[in-house]
C-alpha cells in the first residue's frame, strides 16, 4: 500500500533572467527512492538515479543544474518557462509518486514564493 505523500514548493514565481529551485520531498513512507524524474509538461528535464547519478536532458544542459539534493535548479528563466513541473519519484516497494509545482516567470521584479502544499 502506498502511504507516502509528496510535499512540493507549490505555486512559485520568479523573475525573468533569474533562477529558481524546484524541490519535492517524499514523506510518510519507508520506501526507498530509486529514481526521481523532473518533467515540464511532457518534456523530460532531468533524472536523478540512486545508482547512476544525474542525467540532464541535452536541450536543457546549459540552464538546468542538478540539486540541491533531489531538487532541480532552473537558471536563465524566460517567460516560456512558465507552467507545470512534475517530480516523479520511483520507489521500492511502493511504486511511483508524483508531485506538481506551478512556476510563473514574471517580467517585473515582484516575484514571491507561494505556500507549500501536499499531494497525497
Amino acid at each position: 500500500m502506498m502511504t507516502g505523500t509528496i510535499e512540493t514548493t507549490g505555486n512559485i514565481s520568479a523573475e525573468k533572467g533569474g533562477s529558481i529551485i524546484l524541490q519535492c520531498h517524499l514523506s510518510s513512507t519507508t520506501a526507498q527512492v530509486t529514481q526521481v524524474n523532473w518533467e515540464q509538461q511532457d518534456q523530460l528535464l532531468a533524472i536523478c538515479n540512486a545508482d547512476l547519478g544525474w542525467h540532464i536532458s541535452p536541450s536543457f544542459k546549459d540552464r538546468v543544474a542538478p540539486g540541491p539534493g533531489l531538487g532541480l535548479t532552473l537558471q536563465s528563466l524566460t517567460v516560456n518557462d512558465t507552467g507545470e513541473y512534475f517530480c516523479i519519484y520511483h520507489t521500492y516497494p511502493d511504486g511511483t509518486y508524483t508531485g506538481r509545482i506551478f512556476l510563473e516567470v514574471l517580467e517585473s521584479s515582484v516575484a514571491e514564493h507561494g505556500a507549500r502544499f501536499q499531494i497525497p
Partner: antibody
Amino acid sequence: QVQLVQSGAEVKKPGASVKVSCKASGYAFSRYSMYWVRQAPGQGLEWIAFIDPYNGGSTYNQRFRGKATLTVDTSISTAYMELSRLRSDDTAVYYCARGGDYGWYLGVWGQGTLVTVSS
Amino acid sequence: DIQMTQSPSSLSASVGDRVTITCRASQSIYSYLSWYQQKPGKAPKLLIYNAKSLPSGVPSRFSGSGSGTDFTLTISSLQPEDFATYYCQHHYGNPLTFGQGTKVEIK
C-alpha cells in the same frame, strides 16, 4: 549527421595498456554523455562506463573500476578510454556510443575498435 | 545487479513473418528498457528506447511494449535486412546490463 569515429585496431601484450579514442562530430559534444561498451568475440554486450563531457564526471561499472579510465578533450570533441593491465580476456571489440536524450541508453554508436591481447 | 533474460536465444523466420522477442528483467525497471539491432561485423543500432519509443529513422514495423519486468520487441513484417541479433538493455541502475541476445535467422 551525428558520427563517432574510433581509432584503429590494436595488438597488445598482457600487462600493457591501450588508449582508444572516439572522435565525435555533427552535434554539441558536451551535451551528451559518452558510453563505452565491449563485446568479446562471439559474445554479448557489456557496459563499461560513461563520462559526461560537460563536467568530466564518470560513472563506472564496478567490474571495470581500476581497469578502464575515461577522459575527454572537449576542444577536439574526442573521448578516450584507457585500459590498463591488459589480459587475454580483455580481447574484444570496444565501442563508444553517445548517450540518449532521455536517459542512460545508447543512441549512436562508433564503428568499434578491436583490441587483441596476446603474448 | 539487474539481470536481463531474452527469449528465445535464436529463431528462424521467413520474410513477411511477424516476429516477437521477449526480455525479462530480474526486478522492476518501469519502462527503462531499450532494444538494439546488431548485424555481423557491425556496431549495434538503437531501435527502441523507454520500452516503446522509436528514434527517428527506425522503420515503423518495429515496435516495443511492456513495463515492469516483461517487455516485447515486435517486427510486424520481417524484411530481408532485419536478419540480425537483437539485444535488450535496461537503463535503470548501475550496472547497465544487456540481455544475452536473440539471433533472428532465415528459415
